[in-house]
Interface confidence: low
């Protein structure tokens, strides 16, 4: 038997990927482990090999199909098992009956770009990636802007309570370098969480016109 506490957490990206992290205190070393996905109403099943991400946690991605294919629905239940090899047998180490649309974490927004920049404001747009058409417009976003001399953790969060894939940042300082990030979350799902932050978009405001009062 393996001693210690085990935690097995998985999220569905709403299309064709389930990402899982398994952590185990006092876990087995040098043992091959995998996640096995067994849907209740689908003909397929899928496995992925758990790879170490720290001393006591492992992660893997269950690739269910083409990135934009809709592999699961709101009525699906997928039994997810952590299986570790013990000699010639596979031992169940952790298990959950996973409701994909209750455990959503979308991919980070992509294609961030500056639409228009001025001295004090900047209009930025982005796109969501691999998000299910089931959500329609039921998404929300958080954005943050990194100012010179500050950290991301200090940046105030701007909340967009609707599916709005653009923002107009205002009260910016002229001729200043900024970075911008955005993340997305569906409104659906009891255990749904925010996507990772997007890759930062760097931009610079225009300098103030000479002789003008700014």
């Amino acid at each position: 038997a393996v001693n210690g506490t085990s935690q097995f957490t998985c999220f569905y990206n709403s299309r064709a990927n389930i990402s899982c992290v398994w952590s185990q205190d006092g876990a087995l070393q040098d043992t091959s482990c995998q996640v096995h996905a067994w849907p209740d109403r689908r003909r397929w099943n899928q496995t992925c090999e758990l790879l170490p991400v720290s001393q006591a946690s492992w992660a893997c991605n269950l690739i269910l199909g083409a990135p934009d294919s809709q592999k699961l629905t709101t009525v699906d239940i997928v039994t997810l098992r952590v299986l570790c090899r013990e000699g010639v047998r596979w031992r169940v180490m952790a298990i959950q009956d996973f409701k994909p649309f209750e455990n959503l974490r979308l991919m980070a927004p992509i294609s961030l770009q500056v639409v228009h920049v001025e001295t004090h404001r900047c209009n930025i747009s982005w796109e969501i990636s691999q998000a299910s058409h089931y959500f329609e417009r039921h998404l929300e976003f958080e954005a943050r802007t990194l100012s010179p001399g500050h950290t991301w953790e200090e940046a105030p969060l701007l909340t967009l309570k609707q599916k709005q894939e653009w923002i107009c940042l205002e009260t910016l300082t002229p001729d200043t370098q900024y970075e911008f990030q955005v993340r997305v979350k569906p409104l659906q799902g009891e255990f749904t969480t925010w996507s990772p932050w997007s890759q930062p978009l760097a931009f610079r405001t225009k300098p103030a016109a000479l002789g003008k009062d700014t």
Partner: nanobody, 123 residues
Framework: QVQLVESGGGLVQAGGSLRLACALS????????MAWFRQAPGKGREFVAS????????DYVASVQGRFTVSRDNNKNTVYLQMNSLKPEDTAVYYC????????????????WGQGTQVTVSS
Amino acid sequence: QVQLVESGGGLVQAGGSLRLACALSGDVFVRYTMAWFRQAPGKGREFVASVTDSGRTTDYVASVQGRFTVSRDNNKNTVYLQMNSLKPEDTAVYYCAANTDYFQIRSLDRNTWGQGTQVTVSS
């Protein structure tokens, strides 16, 4: 060391009901597919019902299908066998079994066993 302890057996009249319970200790319960077997006097041990680790899939021998229901409570480390419409031919010692390999639960020699609980059905 894994231990299984059954309870709930007894004497019941034909047509009556009993609920057996089996508690697992010494390991993590959700690692195990659980099953019930029975052994009537002078006969071999036979498979009755099983439930997979998640509780989602159950399996029954034909003779108890529709009368017996196997279930589990992963928070209580316990598996149950609800027995309705009991018949005299259900009289046996009922054994709880556990196996971490859910493909092997019907295999008599690879399971961990409880000590058994007597069920007697009188006519």
